[in-house]
């Protein structure tokens, strides 16, 4: 269920869940928001100061990197 994640616990979870995609500590500008002036929401606010579940955590994964053929 939802839990608070701070410090190393948060980095561990992001690394495991996001894997090759990597992750952001702040959602990219405009991510999930229609207003350019909306304050950025950070993962620390969402997952450390409040509890967050796995799906919330996944929102901070970076987009897929288009890997080129070797």
């Amino acid at each position: 269920g939802p839990e608070t994640l701070c410090g190393a616990e948060l980095v561990d979870a992001l690394q495991f869940v996001c894997g090759d995609r990597g992750f952001y500590f702040n959602k990219p500008t405009g991510y999930g928001s229609s207003s350019r002036r909306a304050p950025q929401t950070g993962i620390v606010d969402e997952c450390c100061f409040r509890s967050c579940d796995l799906r919330r955590l996944e929102m901070y994964c970076a987009p897929l990197k288009p890997a080129k053929s070797a």
Epitope: L5, A8, E9, D20, L54, L64, A67
Partner: antibody, heavy 118, light 106 residues
């Protein structure tokens, strides 16, 4: 050198419980998140469970949620998997694993066999 | 979950010949990772990041591909390469492996 040694496997009847252990050495155990991966003859390799370095965060594959509990004792450099309400489909070799970023599932123990059979 | 499908399930190749294993993901992934498992041993990381060789892996192994289709190639099969090979995706949670490809000597 990273060493992971699993124990606690065996033959158990459906519905019963078993606790697996994994003794870690050769690295700073408390700095690494850990996972269990299992290998059943019919299902190949399956990630089972994850626990963060401090033990405060855990994730499970859907088929074991509510039945399995991953935990760790950083003072003993040991990882655990408590398996309750075991089913025939849980029969597998269970591996303790860890990884570095990009080197996913880079380190494995030798595995311990769990057989669920009546 | 992303489903990983390897082909073929098994292949027999003559010593010194090329062996090619394919892995297809049900959705696009950033990279593919490959593991080698010899009888009675745990899997061993072989190739990471689609094409990078893990430490100590001979250069007869190579990886390529992008999107949903990836390939592991053994350019000149040696006796010690007899094993089961697995692909892994780590672009989407949860991590998922292919079903494995058994490589034997013809």
């Amino acid at each position: 050198e990273v060493q992971l040694v699993e124990s606690g496997g065996g033959v158990v009847q459906p519905g019963r419980s078993l606790r697996l252990s994994c003794a870690a050495s050769g690295f700073t155990f408390s700095n690494y998140y850990m996972t269990w991966v299992r290998q059943a003859p019919t299902k190949g390799l399956e990630w089972v469970a994850y626990i963060s370095s401090g033990g405060g965060s855990t994730y499970y594959r859907d088929s074991v949620k509510g039945r399995f509990t991953i935990s760790r004792d950083n003072s003993k450099n040991t990882l655990y998997l408590q398996m309750n309400s075991l089913r025939a489909e849980d029969t597998a070799v269970y591996y303790c694993t860890t990884e570095d970023y990009g080197y996913w599932f880079a380190y494995w123990g030798q595995g311990t066999l769990v057989t669920v059979s009546s | 979950d992303i489903v990983m499908t390897q082909s073929p399930d098994s292949l027999a190749v003559s010593l010194g010949e090329r062996a090619t294993i394919n892995c297809r993901a049900s959705s696009s992934v950033s990279y593919m990772h490959w593991y080698q498992q010899k009888p009675g041993q745990p899997p061993k990381l072989l190739i990471y990041g689609t094409s990078k060789l893990a430490s100590g892996v001979p250069d007869r192994f190579s990886g390529s591909g992008s999107g949903t289709d990836f390939t592991l190639t053994i350019s000149s099969l040696q006796a010690e390469d007899v094993a089961v090979y697995y692909c892994l995706q780590r672009s989407s949670y949860p991590p998922t492996f292919g079903q494995g490809t058994k490589v034997e000597i013809k």
